[in-house]
Interface confidence: low
């Protein structure tokens, strides 16, 4: 029943071109190239893509033509290695070109940069964008794919095609509207926010595959799909997991044409077999392809079958537990995870994986004991503290969020995480803590039954951002330890960190706390980031500062900005009042 078993093709590039069509082929090759060579100008990438496309067309016409039998990695790698400025732009990445496949592709993958040194994307005036859209729609949309792909080198390529389709629809509709800005800007904001979330979610999938292996990803997928499709049989879930793993392995490995093609096949399979998968798929399956795949990926959990029997019978009380486990360990553990997950849509995936790991550890120990049954009889009791820990944490943090509101909740997390890992760069601490703080507005509004899967699985995504950014320039052994020891225990590991007593406070630098009139023209969000950056720096200077001390300084800072932004001579106000503020802050914190 494998969706992806295909006949051998003489020419892989011709096969993918025919399967995907020229438009999608070109878009996916552009994404692939931009994700590898993140610094190359747009025009250079377009030229490379056009050359590859023309070559693919010759292979479609004659699959036996010269070089058409080469693998996609060989063809694309050869093309990337023709870039004249590779050495001066990318340094040691150019050494990849001396290698043979598959080592060359692995080398390119290792040089993907999660935090490339690229300018922030500034949104032009609406009229300027609409003119550019009307002048050359195709170039305008390619530019969107290019700019997103180079900044997000692990963005899920077939999903980026869906974003581009929505981007195009927004401009098509709004550039004809009476009030273009009122129509367009909210849509672009929504796409930007959804895009960042999508990128971060996919980054976790790729990290899971690349750092912890296929088994870790498959376990995650079994748990998530079992929650989503609780009526599906274990064999059906296993088949979907196998296919989904192939899709994500391909995309994370830079095989974007194969990934998009296989994702399409998987969507088709799911829709043709809805009856044995989920009752919630009907609407998704009536949509066009890109929308269909997105919809399936986001579909709500189906209702749990009525009268599911107790898990204890098969996994604790049965005398055959050790026999079944020994015969096929991963299948038996997969069944345990499936059965537990389909009964617990109220648990986070990472919690379900912790329970499965505890169960596995217990069986490993007990099945070698004199009386196995006696040994594992109480295994379910070991689950209780594992379940209660995230429940309590979420309850406490949601109470704090409701009390403080999002901005001040983010500030509380900024202080908490800066004290835990003060060596981490300030921009990373600000970005990660702001995102951690968004868990409040995202998840605390949900009823109890939906809070944990929302909160803890979201936190896994955000902490992975910290892990990948830290991996680029490691500065903290504690971060490395929490990031690498266990994928499912990352959040508990960070939660358990106390103040780093070994940290030597940063030297005080008045320049860090010098502000200018330009802060007055910033958006509210940008102004918040400025203030939160100052807060992190304060904690790095004075890690033992109390909440009260920090609050007093931040209140003074807010009043200072407000006062000077209302002043006639703003720059003078910032210079003079700024000096006073620095002196007062130093006194308040005993610096």
């Amino acid at each position: 029943r494998g969706v992806f078993r295909r006949d051998a093709h003489k020419s892989e590039v011709a096969h993918r071109f025919k399967d995907l069509g020229e438009e999608n082929f070109k878009a996916l090759v552009l994404i692939a190239f931009a994700q590898y060579l993140q610094q190359c100008p747009f025009e250079d990438h377009v030229k490379l893509v056009n050359e590859v496309t023309e070559f693919a067309k010759t292979c479609v016409a004659d699959e036996s033509a010269e070089n058409c039998d080469k693998s996609l990695h060989t063809l694309f790698g050869d093309k990337l290695c023709t870039v004249a400025t590779l050495r001066e732009t990318y340094g040691e990445m150019a050494d990849c070109c001396a290698k043979q496949e598959p080592e060359r592709n692995e080398c390119f993958l290792q040089h993907k940069d999660d935090n490339p040194n690229l300018p922030r994307l500034v949104r032009p005036e609406v009229d300027v964008m609409c003119t550019a859209f009307h002048d050359n729609e195709e170039t305008f949309l390619k530019k969107y794919l290019y700019e997103i792909a180079r900044r997000h080198p692990y963005f899920y390529a077939p999903e980026l095609l869906f974003f581009a389709k929505r981007y195009k629809a927004a401009f098509t509709e709004c550039c004809q509207a009476a009030d273009k800005a009122a129509c367009l800007l909210p849509k672009l904001d929504e796409l930007r926010d959804e895009g960042k979330a999508s990128s971060a979610k996919q980054r976790l999938k790729c990290a899971s595959l690349q750092k912890f292996g296929e088994r870790a990803f498959k376990a995650w997928a079994v748990a998530r799909l079992s929650q989503r499709f609780p009526k599906a049989e274990f064999a059906e879930v296993s088949k979907l997991v196998t296919d989904l793993t192939k899709v994500h392995t391909e995309c994370c490995h830079g095989d974007l044409l194969e990934c998009a093609d296989d994702r399409a096949d998987l969507a088709k399979y799911i829709c043709e077999n809805q009856d044995s998968i989920s009752s919630k798929l009907k609407e998704c399956c009536e949509k066009p392809l890109l929308e269909k795949s997105h919809c399936i990926a986001e579909v709500e959990n189906d209702e749990m079958p009525a009268d599911l029997p107790s898990l204890a019978a098969d996994f604790v009380e049965s005398k055959d537990v050790c026999k079944n486990y020994a015969e096929a360990k991963d299948v038996f553990l997969g069944m345990f995870l499936y059965e537990y997950a389909r009964r617990h849509p109220d648990y986070s995936v990472v919690l379900l994986l912790r329970l499965a790991k505890t169960y596995e550890t217990t069986l490993e120990k007990c099945c070698a004991a004199a009386d196995p049954h006696e040994c594992y009889a109480k295994v379910f009791d070991e689950f209780k503290p594992l379940v209660e820990e995230p429940q309590n944490l979420i309850k406490q943090n949601c109470e704090l969020f409701e009390q403080l509101g999002e901005y001040k909740f983010q500030n509380a997390l900024l202080v908490r995480y800066t004290k835990k890992v003060p060596q981490v760069s300030t921009p990373t601490l600000v970005e990660v803590s702001r995102n951690l703080g968004k868990v409040g507005s995202k998840c605390c509004k949900h009823p109890e039954a939906k809070r944990m899967p929302c909160a803890e699985d979201y936190l896994s995504v955000v902490l992975n951002q910290l892990c990948v950014l830290h991996e680029k320039t490691p500065v903290s052994d504690r971060v490395t330890k929490c990031c690498t020891e266990s994928l499912v225990n990352r959040r508990p590991c960070f939660s358990a960190l106390e103040v780093d007593e070994t940290y030597v406070p940063k030297e005080f630098n008045a320049e860090t706390f010098t502000f200018h009139a330009d802060i007055c023209t910033l958006s509210e969000k940008e102004r918040q980031i400025k203030k939160q950056t100052a807060l992190v720096e304060l904690v790095k200077h004075k890690p033992k500062a109390t909440k009260e001390q920090l609050k007093a300084v931040m209140d003074d800072f807010a009043a200072f900005v407000e006062k000077c932004c209302k002043a006639d001579d703003k720059e003078t106000c910032f210079a003079e009042e700024g000096k006073k503020l620095v002196a007062a802050s130093q006194a308040a914190l005993g610096l």
Epitope: K18, E23, A260, L289, L290, S293
Partner: nanobody, 115 residues
Framework: QVQLVESGGGLVQPGGSLRLSCAAS????????MAWYRQAPGQQREFVAR???????NYPDSVKGRFTISRDNSKNTLYLQMNSLRAEDTAVYYC?????????WGQGTLVTVSS
């Protein structure tokens, strides 16, 4: 965009045959997959047959051996030859096409199998 227009539907007796056609126009160079779906009153849309640009086909068990999908690329037309028709084959039949998924749809043609 791609426009699809079905024809050939009608009333036929059980055991009889019918041939549906679907004419495609517009940006047809991007079309790789073409398919037939059907929807009976009160039922969800059901997949009937698919053909790729290269000519490979697939069918669900319910129609395998009775229905044959084919395409004439020179005429930009898709066909569905339906033999041994049954009452349960009564439905509106839709032609669908697309580069990766079937994202363009026709308006449908009604097939009624009744004595």
């Amino acid at each position: 965009q791609v426009q699809l227009v079905e024809s050939g539907g009608g009333l036929v007796q059980p055991g009889g045959s019918l041939r549906l056609s679907c004419a495609a126009s517009g940006s047809i160079e991007s079309i790789n997959r073409m398919a037939w779906y059907r929807q009976a009153p009160g039922q969800q849309r059901e997949f009937v047959a698919r053909i790729s640009k290269g000519g490979s086909t697939n069918y669900p068990d319910s129609v395998k051996g009775r229905f044959t999908i084919s395409r004439d690329n020179s005429k930009n037309t898709l066909y569905l030859q339906m033999n041994s028709l049954r009452a349960e084959d009564t439905a509106v039949y839709y032609c669908a096409a697309g580069p990766v998924w079937e994202q363009f749809w026709g308006q449908g043609t009604l097939v009624t199998v009744s004595s």
